[in-house]
Interface confidence: low
């Protein structure tokens, strides 16, 4: 593979040992400049597997606020607007990276943490377990 | 509100100005120890709005590999297994934080970046625009 040479303008590493500590600039760069901010704002209501968004706040985490999706129904909404229990609403989950203050309550020291969040719901055909 | 005192064992901040630079330990702590690793592994196939997962790799980003969902159909799969174009498959998108090497190619200096990823797809009722 291609080896990219180290940039000579890099800051010196404070800690050469693992656990590896790096410098991170918290001034967020947003790559989503050309996206519609309303991109999926109403999917949670229009979906056949609708969901509600619940606020999860933790001041020791960055970002401190994360929104969690909870499916409204066990089944899915059919064409008549009723819940069809022959199908299942299930959460689509994703592992995301967050920063956890470490040691606790420190304003400028963090540890990377992987957490599982539910982003929305989708309607799936259930797995039927036949009784032998 | 409750003010949590600063931990006296915190490292000193290198830079008191914005953009704020912090120390981050890259030894990831995984909070998802009790989750099923197959939690949604087959939803992409069983969903009425199925999707494929595409690999997005960028060595200047941490994590360097991100999986992007692409909906397979414009419509949704009905009870007969056919695509129903009265409904729409749409991607559920989420803004996530990643670390971008800055300056480029530096092993120990990053900047937080917000990117938009498609996690999966859901089936929605289309918005019908009536012609006046």
């Amino acid at each position: 593979g291609i080896t990219i040479p180290r940039n000579p303008g890099c800051p010196n590493s404070e800690d050469k040992n693992f656990p590896r500590t790096v410098m991170v600039n918290l001034n967020i760069h947003n790559r989503n400049t050309n996206t519609n901010p309303k991109r999926s704002s109403d999917y949670y209501n229009r979906s056949t597997s609708p969901w509600n968004l619940h606020r999860n706040e933790d001041p020791e985490r960055y970002p401190s606020v994360i929104w969690e999706a909870k499916c409204r129904h066990l089944g899915c909404i059919n064409a008549d607007g009723n819940v069809d229990y022959h199908m299942n609403s299930v959460p689509i989950q994703q592992e995301i990276l967050v920063l956890r203050r470490e040691p606790p309550h420190c304003p400028n020291s963090f540890r990377l943490e992987k957490i599982l969040v539910s982003v929305g719901c989708t309607c799936v055909t259930p797995i039927v377990h036949h009784v032998a | 509100g409750i003010t949590i005192p600063r931990n006296p064992g915190c490292p000193n901040s290198e830079d008191k100005n914005f953009p704020r630079t912090v120390m981050v330990n890259l030894n990831i702590h995984n909070r998802n120890t009790n989750t099923n690793p197959k939690r949604s592994s087959d939803y992409y196939n069983r969903s009425t709005s199925p999707w494929n997962l595409h690999r997005n790799e960028d060595p200047e980003r941490y994590p360097s590999v991100i999986w992007e969902a692409k909906c397979r159909h414009l419509g949704c799969i009905n009870a007969d297994g056919n695509v129903d174009y009265h409904m729409n498959s749409v991607p559920i998108q989420q803004e996530i934080l990643v670390l971008r090497r800055e300056p480029p190619h530096c092993p120990n200096s990053f900047r937080l970046e917000k990117i938009l990823v498609s996690v999966g797809c859901t089936c929605v009722t289309p918005i019908v625009h009536h012609v006046a």
Epitope: P37, S41, D42, N45, N52, L53, E57, S64 | -
Partner: antibody
């Protein structure tokens, strides 16, 4: 403790303009959607407008669309409502509210009175 | 837009139970959360029930909320009535672009 303090109300003539402000404290302002709700004297509550935490999405009741503009300055923890082309029926106490989720006003200010009269 | 219809007034004696209804005119009530707000004279509203049946901290368990999909209506039930419960009560719901309040119900504790 969540605190919302409205200001900017007063007496204005029909056709005039007024700008309401809501100073927020006790929470991370930019993380919350915010709303304006009004109440005419002796009447019920009427939702006026809402804005997302980032300010990127705004929503209005049909009765004020095109006349009122909601905005926010997250650096100042302040919500605004610019009211133009005011009518007598806009006379009300205007409340600023912090949303729990979209459409759910969790915390309310004490309100500011707007009177539109000649 | 849809409407939310509430009875203009209800009255009951202390210690009893009272139920206030809220009917949605169009669109499924079950698809959107219903909230209930209490407003005492001269004060700002406060939320007593959110997300159909959830009570914020500090609201006594005498207050409960429910929805009935078959009648497309929501209900606020207050048990063991106290004189301090005398107030106006508003139901509220929404759709993706608009928020709607009911006309309000004046609760008198006799």
């Amino acid at each position: 403790e969540v605190q919302l303090l409205e200001s900017g109300g007063g007496l204005v003539q029909p056709g005039g303009s007024l700008r309401l402000s809501c100073a927020a404290s006790g929470f991370t302002f930019s993380s919350y959607a915010m709303s304006w709700v009004r109440q005419a004297p002796g009447k019920g509550l009427e939702w006026v407008s809402a804005i997302s935490g980032s300010g990127g999405s705004t929503y209005y009741a049909d009765s004020v669309k095109g006349r009122f503009t909601i905005s926010r300055d997250n650096s100042k923890n302040t919500l605004y409502l610019q009211m133009n082309s005011l009518r007598a029926e806009d006379t009300a106490v205007y409340y600023c509210a912090r949303d729990l989720i979209w459409g759910v006003a969790g915390s309310w200010g004490q309100g500011t009175m707007v009177t539109v009269s000649s | 837009n849809f409407m939310l219809t509430q009875p203009h007034s209800v009255s009951e004696s202390p210690g009893k139970t009272v139920t206030i209804s809220c009917t949605r005119s169009s669109g499924s009530l079950a698809n959107y959360y219903v909230q209930w707000y209490q407003q005492r004279p001269g004060s700002a509203p406060t939320i007593v029930i959110f997300a159909n049946n959830q009570r914020p901290s500090g609201v006594p368990d005498r207050f409960s909320g429910s929805i009935d999909s078959s009648s497309n209506s929501a209900s606020l039930t207050i048990s063991r009535l106290k004189t301090e419960d005398e107030a106006d009560y508003y139901c509220q719901s929404y759709d993706p672009r608009v928020v709607v309040f009911g006309g309000g119900t004046k609760l008198t504790v006799l």
